[in-house]
Amino acid sequence: QPQGLSGMQGEPSLGDSSSGEDELGVDVLPSEEDAPEEADPPDGEDPPEVNSEDRMEESLGLEDLSTPEAPEHSQGSHGDEKGGGHSHWSYGGTLLWPQVSPACAGRFQSPVDIRLERTAFCRTLQPLELLGYELQPLPELSLSNNGHTVQLTLPPGLKMALGPGQEYRALQLHLHWGTSDHPGSEHTVNGHRFPAEIHVVHLSTAFSELHEALGRPGGLAVLAAFLQESPEENSAYEQLLSHLEEISEEGSKIEIPGLDVSALLPSDLSRYYRYEGSLTTPPCSQGVIWTVFNETVKLSAKQLHTLSVSLWGPRDSRLQLNFRATQPLNGRTIEASFPAAEDSSPEPVHVNSCFTAGD
């Protein structure tokens, strides 16, 4: 691999680092406009295609929707193939994603709505272990606007263990967000959507390259955390957000100083939700092990605003509302590393449902 990248923009400077977090408490349970969908049918199957997303959007007065589940603001219309076989996809045309990649019509897709009362407490889910996430300013990291999200490419050496013998290395992180007045997390909790969500994507050490792992159970693992508003600025996130202006145009890429990636995640790595799903964008490959932290990461209102207004996507449209609608569980159980269900008994339930990556 060639060394010594010189980006298209100026050389940024380094900020300081810290993280603020909060628990998913009663303050994040569904508000009126974020009502959860009706209960699943008796056979345990979820309703097809979409959950309450269409009702939620309608109640918020967002009228320019091209599909039931996704706003059109962010990516313009889908699928105006420009010749040359581009794999065009957009958040305004998610019903067409299976045409881009058949896996997007799979039965075990992400994101999902995490219904606390339906989670299964699983004592075998141990605290995650992160190693080497506290990066030094040098070497610098590539920060890019790929038209769908802001992406930070991570260097080799960031190791994560889901459990004994389940080791992964971090590849990249990216964010999902809404607008100034509409939240944009991908996962939801009891139907509640958070302002934004971070994903840190990992490749199993059992595979040397990404293409080998795509679609294989446990081949990829994603750590996800919700971003929530608080009065104080998050200095760790400021090291990313302060550079968004420099990559405002689609296709922009710059180099920024290395930072403490663990500071972008909650401090409590022991309380989380776990399920097997997919990539949330095409090709929507399944077999992805999802870990969604219970603790939220706090950003200031100004920082969340900066995230939602700084980037531009295709056809001179703002890069906003870049989240996929929640997908049916289709019989999947979401496990929790702690008793998340409000009425959970002292004894763990569904212990036998616990799975390990690769099972």
């Epitope: 691999q1 990516q75 420009k82 040359g84 076989g85 581009h86 794999s87 065009h88 996809w89 957009s90 990649s101 890019s144 790929n146 038209g147 769908h148 992406q151 490419t153 590849l171 990249q172 994507v201 490749l203 390259e209 990404l210 293409h211 080998e212 795509l214 679609g215 990829l220 689609e250 296709g251 964008t281 095409p282 090709p283 490959s285 996507g313 295709p314």
Partner: nanobody, 117 residues
């Protein structure tokens, strides 16, 4: 194994043109359709410079030094990335590398472009 193979480099006079190609092969899943594709270059004794990017939507971005002279394009049906280079200058002399960025970076081995009279 996934491979990116550049071709089309060579010796050209100032003001001339070249078309570089980058063919992706070996991947069991066509991840390159979902990758942002880029051309980088490295001149002798210099660092790596990002020349042009094309996203999955076809959006393009160029470095100031090549804007208006170079054109990046892609053909996902052929798993191929292109760089049309016109009005070449001596300072465009470099090894040109192809890059695919989808969750992880894939790099080619590079092709030499020499602009000299």
């Amino acid at each position: 194994e996934v491979q990116l193979l550049e071709s089309g480099g060579g010796l050209v006079q100032p003001g001339g043109s070249l078309r570089l190609s980058c063919a992706a092969s070996g991947n069991s899943v066509n991840i390159f359709s979902f990758a942002a594709m880029s051309w980088y270059r490295q001149a002798p004794g210099k660092g790596l410079e990002l020349v042009a990017v094309i996203t999955t939507t076809g959006g393009t971005k160029y470095s100031d030094s090549v804007k208006g002279r170079f054109t990046i394009s892609r053909d996902n049906s052929k798993n191929t990335l292109y760089l049309q280079m016109n009005s070449l200058r001596a300072e465009d002399t470099a090894v040109y590398y192809c890059n695919a960025d989808y969750l992880q970076d894939y790099w080619g081995q590079g092709t030499q472009v020499t602009v000299s009279s």
